[in-house]
């Protein structure tokens, strides 16, 4: 009868076992081992006992001891199990970002690992189990499917091994994978909404201002805005679950038309666009031409108001005629012209919006100097002694210089306070000059002596 | 000085009609002209312009169901593709105007149509 | 774009009341406003114009005010007459996409 010890043996791979192999006749013929497994004899005293050490033990194996006796041949086998823990365990990869909502598969793949039998693969989030299943097939595939929750952003997702040697004395050895990082968002079906003028003027400055409601994680979205070829820098305030961006945008003449106006929100791996466009334009104030802008009394006047190809002018309200971008009037000048205001008004229509612009341009008339009985009465008669003020305007764009004096020398004092006395009395001859010429004119002043009784 | 729509009449949905405003005692050529609409139970609204010198612009929801055009005497609005939706009185309103305190253009309907019944149905 | 926001939508008023209407514009149109007055079967009737100027051959009952983005018409002395539909409208822009009327005001006279 042919014996073996140890019958069963767990080992780790590559690993070495002593097998014994006994017979229980005193004088077998023959004991040995059956065995593809590297051997080595260990020497021991007795006939009926034979030790070999089996090294480089790769996998399940079944040696078997055998022996010749005078009664006859047996055999014994041992069973030999080699444990080795899987060389891959893997999920499989997924975009790191996934939307809130969406059928999320994990599949995790373990390559290798023995025994089989006392290996499970488990699906993880953080230290909760979604899914336990044997091991089974090369590779071992697992797969669960999780409803991608809100809660869920900067969850790990693993997959763990445990080859549970525990019953066989050892120990349950673990293996994870690298974890994956699920970052979940929502990123509404609205685009976002974009604030912007819809017309801007060449060498000014707008504010775009585009915001999205419904985000989620916020923090996270990136807001690109553009005008044309123009990437805009916007200050983006974070809400909640919204965010908005707003930015300045210059436009210079090389601008000048149509142009596109982003707003693109990406977050995760999707985005949301809303285009708008603008119209960029050019529209220098209205340009007011006097034929002169000072002209002497009589002269006749031309006021030409001219404005951009498209717009329409008024000159001091009247429309243009023809409806256009140039009026013009003709007016002799007179004194009561001297300051007065043309005023050009120009409308100009851009992509359905009026754009308004004005321009106003003073003529000064020159004319005089005046002296005239209203203004510089002829005849003053004032009682003695009593407080007067002489009075005498000279009329005359630029003002005239006036004098009033009695025999070339004794001057009357115009627009001051005084006591009337003889000495006034006379005639003056008041002269009013100025670069448009010289006018005279007398003033007689008569002094009341008082009556005594 | 007067305006005045014609062409309206009971229309099968699909089968596109055009809509005729013609203008009396000023020139179109010194005018913006717009179209409106009031379909039952509904606020006014407002189609679309055609400018002096034939440019258009359309409310966002009229874009593409209207087109504007003119003639020396005449604005048309051509209804692309009516649906029942599009049931509704039709005006057509001067829309152009000056104010000669600041010598400003701005958009003034100030002088309307009676109005043309559009009725599209199966 | 200028969005004229009404208000109210409706308003009930006895004869001889005084009844008011707002119009606000979402970015300033001056004073480029116009109300009109609406009745079945009838083109609009401008009723004022550049916010406060009346029409010619309007009642002077009816006075506009308000400048930038906020507008009103207030209707004094109410007569039976005066039930019909009334309208803001913004003279602006009329850019594409534009709103160019407000929502509406329906007055009731009781």
């Known amino acids: 009868q042919t014996s073996v010890s140890p019958s069963k043996v767990i080992l780790p791979r590559g690993g070495s076992v002593l097998v014994t192999c006994s017979t229980s006749c005193d004088q077998p013929k023959l004991l040995g081992i059956e065995t593809p497994l590297p051997k080595k004899e260990l020497l021991l005293p007795g006939n009926n006992r034979k030790v070999y050490e089996l090294s480089n033990v790769q996998e399940d194996s079944q040696p078997m001891c055998y022996s010749n006796c005078p009664d006859g041949q047996s055999t014994a086998k041992t069973f030999l199990t080699v444990y080795w823990t899987p060389e891959r365990v893997e999920l499989a990869p997924l975009p790191s970002w996934q939307p809130v909502g969406k059928n999320l598969t994990l599949r995790c793949q373990v390559e290798g690992g023995a025994p089989r039998a006392n290996l499970t693969v488990v699906l993880l989030r953080g230290e909760k189990e979604l899914k336990r299943e044997p091991a089974v097939g090369e590779p071992a595939e697992v797969t669960t499917t999780v409803l991608v929750r809100r809660d869920h952003h900067g969850a790990n997702f693993s997959c763990r091994t445990e080859l549970d040697l525990r019953p066989q004395g050892l120990e349950l050895f673990e293996n994870t994978s690298a974890p994956y990082q699920l970052q979940t968002f929502v990123l509404p079906a609205t685009p976002p909404q974009l604030v912007s003028p819809r017309v801007l003027e060449v060498d000014t400055q707008g504010t775009v201002v585009c915001s999205l409601d419904g985000l989620f994680p916020v923090s996270e979205a990136q807001v690109h805005l553009a005008l044309g070829d123009q990437r805009l820098n916007p200050t983006v305030t974070y809400g909640n679950d919204s965010f908005s961006a707003k930015a300045s945008v210059s436009v210079t003449a090389e601008d000048e038309g149509t142009q596109r106006l982003t707003c693109a929100v990406i977050l995760g791996n999707q985005s949301q666009e809303t285009l708008q466009t603008v119209t960029i334009y050019s529209f220098p104030a209205p340009n007011v031409i006097l034929t002169k802008p000072e002209v002497s009394e009589g002269t006749e006047v031309t006021v030409k108001c001219e404005a951009h190809p498209r717009a329409k002018v008024t000159l001091n309200g009247v429309p243009a005629q023809p409806l256009g971008p140039r009026a013009q009037l003709l007016l002799k000048a007179t004194p009561e012209d001297n300051g007065r205001s043309f005023s050009c008004s120009a409308t100009l229509e851009v992509a359905g919006q009026l754009i308004h612009k004005n321009q106003t341009r003073e003529l000064r008339v020159l004319y005089g100097p005046r002296l005239d009985e209203r203004d510089c009465p002829g005849n003053w008669t004032w009682p003695e002694n009593s407080q007067q003020t002489p009075m005498c305007q000279a009329w005359g764009n630029p003002l005239p210089e006036l004098k009033c004096l009695k025999d070339g020398t004794f001057p009357l004092p115009i627009g001051e306070s005084v006591t009337v006395t003889r000495d006034l009395e006379g005639t003056y001859l008041c002269r009013a000059r100025s670069t448009q010429g010289e006018v005279t004119r007398k003033v007689t002043v008569n002094v009341l002596s008082p009556r005594y009784e | 000085q007067s305006v005045e729509e014609s062409g309206g009449r009971l229309v099968t949905p699909g089968t596109p009609l055009t809509l005729t405003c013609t203008a009396s005692?000023?020139?179109?050529?010194?005018?913006?002209m717009s179209w409106v609409r009031q379909a039952p139970g509904k606020g006014l609204e407002w189609i679309g312009i055609?400018?002096?010198?034939?440019s258009t612009y359309y409310a966002s929801w009229a874009k593409g169901r209207f087109t504007i055009s003119k003639t020396s005497t005449t604005v048309d609005l051509k209804i692309t593709s009516p649906t029942t939706e599009d049931t509704a009185t039709y005006f057509c309103?001067?829309?152009?105007?000056?104010?000669?305190?600041?010598?400003?253009?701005?958009?003034?309907?100030?002088?309307w149509g009676p109005g043309t019944l559009v009725t599209v149905s199966a | 774009g200028y969005d004229m926001t009404q208000t109210p939508a409706s308003v009930e008023v006895a004869v001889g009341g005084t009844v008011t209407i707002k119009c606000q514009a979402s970015?300033?149109?001056?004073?480029?406003l116009a109300w009109f007055q609406h009745k079945p079967g009838q083109p609009p009737k401008r009723l004022i114009y550049?916010?406060?100027t009346l029409a010619s051959g309007v009642s002077s009952r009816f006075k506009g005010s308000g400048s930038g983005t906020q507008f009103t018409l207030t209707i004094s002395g109410v007569e039976s007459a005066d039930a019909a539909t009334y309208y803001c409208?913004?003279?602006?822009?009329?850019?594409?996409?534009?709103?160019?009327f407000g929502g509406g005001t329906e007055v009731v006279v009781k």
């Open positions: 309103a001067r829309d152009w105007s000056y104010d000669s305190s600041s010598g400003y253009y701005y958009y003034d309907m100030d002088l």
């Open positions: 005692g000023f020139s179109l050529s010194n005018y913006y």
């Open positions: 055609i400018s002096d010198s034939g």
């Open positions: 970015q300033s149109i001056n004073s480029w």
């Open positions: 550049k916010a406060s």
């Open positions: 409208q913004q003279g602006y822009s009329r850019s594409d996409g534009e709103h160019v």
